[in-house]
Interface confidence: low
């Protein structure tokens, strides 16, 4: 069974669908890609989508509203952090307050810090408005102090 990133997700609510993440890039001095044991940084990110209204549909992953917003956000983050080091996102949650989005981002350790995560996201806000019709405000980024260990067979949410 291929081993991927270990999951340290906190309990999700109505949003247990997750974006995929990938093992580290293979280096040429390995005959097979390495089993991951350390070296992942997690960041908790929260922001408001001020031009959308929260309703009960965002508590139900089967609704079109939930699925379209979740997909747009997943696609958006792949665009923002498409440089090497981004491993994916998980634990997307929607909250009332226009729409408040909370999620966890994973990067290979040492490739990015909290400041850069926030800066890159803020730089993308204009494009998010035009491409996805999402007006983003009140961005907050913080480190997630997960203890990290890779157990055999554990995986980041796909």
């Amino acid at each position: 069974t291929p081993t991927t990133l270990a999951s340290h997700s906190t309990k999700t609510d109505a949003s247990s669908t997750h974006h995929s993440s990938v093992p580290p890039l293979t280096s040429s001095n390995h005959s097979t890609s390495p089993q991951l044991s350390t070296g992942v940084s997690f960041f908790f990110l929260s922001f408001h989508i001020s031009n959308l209204q929260f309703n009960s549909s965002l508590e139900d992953p089967s609704t079109d509203y939930y699925q379209e917003l979740q997909r747009d956000i997943s696609e958006m983050f792949l665009q923002i952090y498409k440089q090497g080091g981004f491993l994916g996102l998980s634990n997307i949650k929607f909250r009332p307050g226009s729409v408040v989005v909370q999620l966890t981002l994973a990067f290979r350790e040492g490739t990015i810090n909290v400041h850069d995560v926030e800066t890159q996201f803020n730089q993308y806000k204009t494009e998010a408005a035009s491409r996805y019709n999402l007006t983003i405000s009140d961005v907050s980024v913080s480190d997630v102090p997960f203890p990290f260990s890779a157990q055999s067979g554990a995986g980041v949410p796909g």
Partner: antibody, heavy 116, light 107 residues
Framework: EVQLQQSGPELVKPKTSMKISCKAS????????MNWVKQSHGKNPEWIGL????????SYNQKFKGKATFTVDRSSSTAYMELLSLTSEDSAVYYC?????????WGQGTTLTVSS | QIVLTQSPALMSASPGEKVTMTCSAS?????MYWYQQKPTSSPKPWIL???NLASGVPTRFSGSGSGTSYSLTISSMEAEDAATYYC??????????FGGGTKLEIK
Amino acid sequence: EVQLQQSGPELVKPKTSMKISCKASGYSFTDFTMNWVKQSHGKNPEWIGLITPYNGGTSYNQKFKGKATFTVDRSSSTAYMELLSLTSEDSAVYYCARGLTYFDQWGQGTTLTVSS
Amino acid sequence: QIVLTQSPALMSASPGEKVTMTCSASSSVSYMYWYQQKPTSSPKPWILLTSNLASGVPTRFSGSGSGTSYSLTISSMEAEDAATYYCQQWNSKPPITFGGGTKLEIK
């Protein structure tokens, strides 16, 4: 170790229904989306749809709406797919598979044969 | 829905030979995933997000591409690589779709 253990092979008659189970172990069942995939003999896989175990939210491939119904039992970490009004076209191997954008863990497959 | 067309459908290669198979999408996709499947076994994730090898995959494998054109390459064919390879896309709209597969045989 992460495992998805599916129920055994089934031989059923046309126009009946049947339910396949997929028992998850080695991870937090409610933290991961579960998908169902059909693979007819010698053909490529087809995504049937997914279920979010935390609250039972579902998303179906339009092609399989009305054919498949997903449920979960969180207490036993088991996902189920019921297939309705079976015909010979439904004969295939069915997999449960974990993930949203790709499938990092797969069950061993359940072979369904529909024959009178 | 997005249709993935793999070519060739069937190919054979000698040990040590370079192998390339392609996956063409009916419209642009952001990323491609590849799976390896051997008879009577479940598919295994092989290449993730276009070019990242899944854990345990030999480094002779590589993936590349963008837009509507993607490929999987084996730099030096080995007997254990004989299998069927499927591409799979995830795009912003469902459903997830798989290609028709490339069956790779060893000469």
